[in-house]
Interface confidence: medium
Amino acid sequence: SIPWNLERITPPRYRADEYQPPDGGSLVEVYLLDTSIQSDHREIEGRVMVTDFENVPEEDGTRFHRQASKCDSHGTHLAGVVSGRDAGVAKGASMRSLRVLNCQGKGTVSGTLIGLEFIRKSQLVQPVGPLVVLLPLAGGYSRVLNAACQRLARAGVVLVTAAGNFRDDACLYSPASAPEVITVGATNAQDQPVTLGTLGTNFGRCVDLFAPGEDIIGASSDCSTCFVSQSGTSQAAAHVAGIAAMMLSAEPELTLAELRQRLIHFSAKDVINEAWFPEDQRVLTPNLVAALPPSTHGAGWQLFCRTVWSAHSGPTRMATAVARCAPDEELLSCSSFSRSGKRRGERMEAQGGKLVCRAHNAFGGEGVYAIARCCLLPQANCSVHTAPPAEASMGTRVHCHQQGHVLTGCSSHWEVEDLGTHKPPVLRPRGQPNQCVGHREASIHASCCHAPGLECKVKEHGIPAPQEQVTVACEEGWTLTGCSALPGTSHVLGAYAVDNTCVVRSRDVSTTGSTSEGAVTAVAICCRSRHLAQASQELQ
Amino acid sequence: QEDEDGDYEELVLALRSEEDGLAEAPEHGTTATFHRCAKDPWRLPGTYVVVLKEETHLSQSERTARRLQAQAARRGYLTKILHVFHGLLPGFLVKMSGDLLELALKLPHVDYIEEDSSVFAQ
């Protein structure tokens, strides 16, 4: 049998008596910023090079007794999880360790910064293949640590970090809150979020995905053949660093954006029991458990998209929230969500030469979220077409008029506090797939894209009786790019994409009463790229 | 004792290298901001990361660090430059009294200053 954690991340076709998926990450170097390590442990001997970098604070307490095996414990275990020859994920990956945590597992932001700088300088002096940096540590939110991670990521380095073990919003911690970093929460053998004493894994919109992080067998620094079971988001992050090394070894040219999208795409979906998370965090927390891709090649043809939630706008009347895609991603649609239902919609707008998704709070609202649908679409040319409020009974319309441009998303934004009870369809009338339609007092925004072989279609699911939630999913081979609602008179809280499903939320039926409430229709825009599919077939 | 000697030596050097030009007013533009960890027990007051504007060169970082030392010395404060950053972010790590933050925030090229804080194995 193989340990539960390795089984969980391994697609069924790899499973055998021994966990030995093809190519163990041998083209990739993984940097570990942690405690000192026991480099002669059988699991990692010859695989981990201990650099001369050390920047740690003194241990607390005058009576602290330095014991080598305890000093090495955390780092040794993680090195084993990443590349251990028997209990590791990427058995072929080589590692370099930097000591930024002392014998009590404590370090400083400044020491970590200097460590990251050391990696960047090493990369410049001796460029090698793909680099993965594992940061199995967390501190309070730090602007400077996040900025350093951003710079390193933009230099082509993949950074993977622990979400934190504080049973709290990961956005309050660094480097977990850095958007460029792949932030990993922890789940157990039952796919439950990991509880650690009175605390547990962090959660929220800053977490990219979860991975095994409880009762993980790995190298123990007690002796060169000892093993120990450890738990935490560090262990979870180590799994993802190993998976990233495997993926990069198979496809060394992958960008950070491509790698992140693949990690999300190949994750197990909707297996985590969300009841563990605070209610207000459930919608924001990704229900994804990391896994290796079923085959190392052939994923290139797919149109990959992910959902990015903004921070909460706050309750002030003119408050807005902004969701952004990564530099290599295209914003294909923008939606908004408010728990109170009081919002003034959303719009796509240019900011620093890039489209962002901005949601607007309304008077008396508790705040809004902007939700961006961020996709990998090579050679894309996207623009936003806006129609101002029409003030005509027929409503506001906007369509993609340029030749070869297809509609990937619709947004609607209104200045008035209340659009009234009669909201005509937010999307196009039937038979006009390249058109968005909205209330006459709202401005409507169509996201129109041209990319080789890109085709899109609209899919609706309407429920006549009022429902708290209406969903519509794109079928196999199609990717959800846009998600919005065609409301009747029901009070829509907003719309957002969860994996390939468009979710439209309405106010709780029990509080609104269902007598006069109208139907709610969830509208998905589903796209695929024939060009990407063709290119992939030609390669094979 | 060693540390004190080191600090004294740096103070003397800072005073010696002070020039009229070092006292010039900071560049006009946006005011630099100060950040610190929201979790009080994790704060490490007395050590600060001074982050300079994106295009600042290493020589300017070193000059700004020396300027801070000189201006601090003029006010009777010891400072110690622990590290000069370049490669990822321009800036420097300085050990100094929090009393000097206002002064440091007015230095040319400064984007923001962050008080050092703890990180922990997870």
């Epitope: 049998s1 340990p3 010859g46 020859r85 028997d86 209990a87 007690d222 000892c226 093993f227 079971s229 | -």
Partner: antibody
Framework: EVQLLESGGGLVQPGGSLRLSCKAS????????MHWVRQAPGKGLEWIGR????????KYNEKFKGKATISRDNSKNTLYLQMNSLRAEDTAVYYC??????????????WGQGTLVTVSS | DIQMTQSPSSLSASVGDRVTITCRAS??????LTWYQQKPGKAPKLLIY???SLQSGVPSRFSGSGSGTDFTLTISSLQPEDFATYYC???????????FGGGTKVEIK
């Protein structure tokens, strides 16, 4: 099927030396540490040392340092034990054993059939 | 250095008997203790690893327990093929070496 086949045993003069071989098959040789263990007639098992075929790193029982040398040839999937300055008390059956990994522990899971070395004039 | 002491050094038992063999380490070896069975003229065979985990293919009448310094191998109902010598083996942290117990010979009564 994992198999370990020792050879090279026999009669050796006191003060002489010998080289034992252990040919491995049925698994990836470089992925598992290999041990040499001996057993004198009517006595218990005694560990001599081990090698990591992946890196070539070795560890020895203090008693055998300077007397035994363990090496390997990964291209031939073969483990070797060189013994020098042999004395009558080195008469024993010599076993090679694979060190297998079992969910957080190791054990000598496959053993060769053993080869008898007799040191006598 | 760690010493491994097995007791008894030999015992006589009948088919169907419950047999218990103990192994004591002079220092804590955690759960890193392995049991082997050896029949005359044959190589040792792995029975139990990590103190209590049964190697696949080994009958369930064999069980192991213990942690730290005291360990036990139990054969719940002795079978004719179980007459053999049993060795415990531990890992010596300080020497990065491997130490065997003196062996316990289980003979037919």
């Amino acid at each position: 099927e994992v198999q370990l086949l020792e050879s090279g045993g026999g009669l050796v003069q006191p003060g002489g030396s010998l080289r034992l071989s252990c040919k491995a098959s049925g698994y990836t040789f470089s992925s598992y540490w290999m041990h040499w263990v001996r057993q004198a007639p009517g006595k218990g098992l005694e560990w001599i040392g081990r090698i990591d075929p992946y890196s070539g790193g070795t560890k020895y029982n203090e008693k055998f340092k300077g007397k035994a040398t363990i090496s390997r040839d990964n291209s031939k999937n073969t483990l070797y034990l060189q013994m020098n300055s042999l004395r009558a008390e080195d008469t024993a059956v010599y076993y090679c054993a694979r060190y297998g990994y079992y969910l957080g522990s190791y054990a000598m899971d496959y053993w060769g059939q053993g080869t008898l070395v007799t040191v006598s004039s | 250095d760690i010493q491994m002491t097995q007791s008894p050094s030999s015992l006589s038992a009948s088919v169907g008997d419950r047999v218990t063999i103990t192994c004591r380490a002079s220092q804590d070896v955690s759960r890193y203790l392995t049991w082997y069975q050896q029949k005359p003229g044959k190589a040792p065979k792995l029975l139990i690893y990590a103190a209590s985990s049964l190697q696949s293919g080994v009958p369930s009448r064999f069980s192991g327990s213990g942690s730290g310094t005291d360990f036990t191998l139990t054969i719940s109902s002795l079978q004719p093929e179980d007459f053999a010598t049993y060795y415990c083996q531990a890992y010596d942290y300080s020497l990065s070496g491997y130490v065997f117990g003196g062996g316990t010979k289980v003979e037919i009564k």
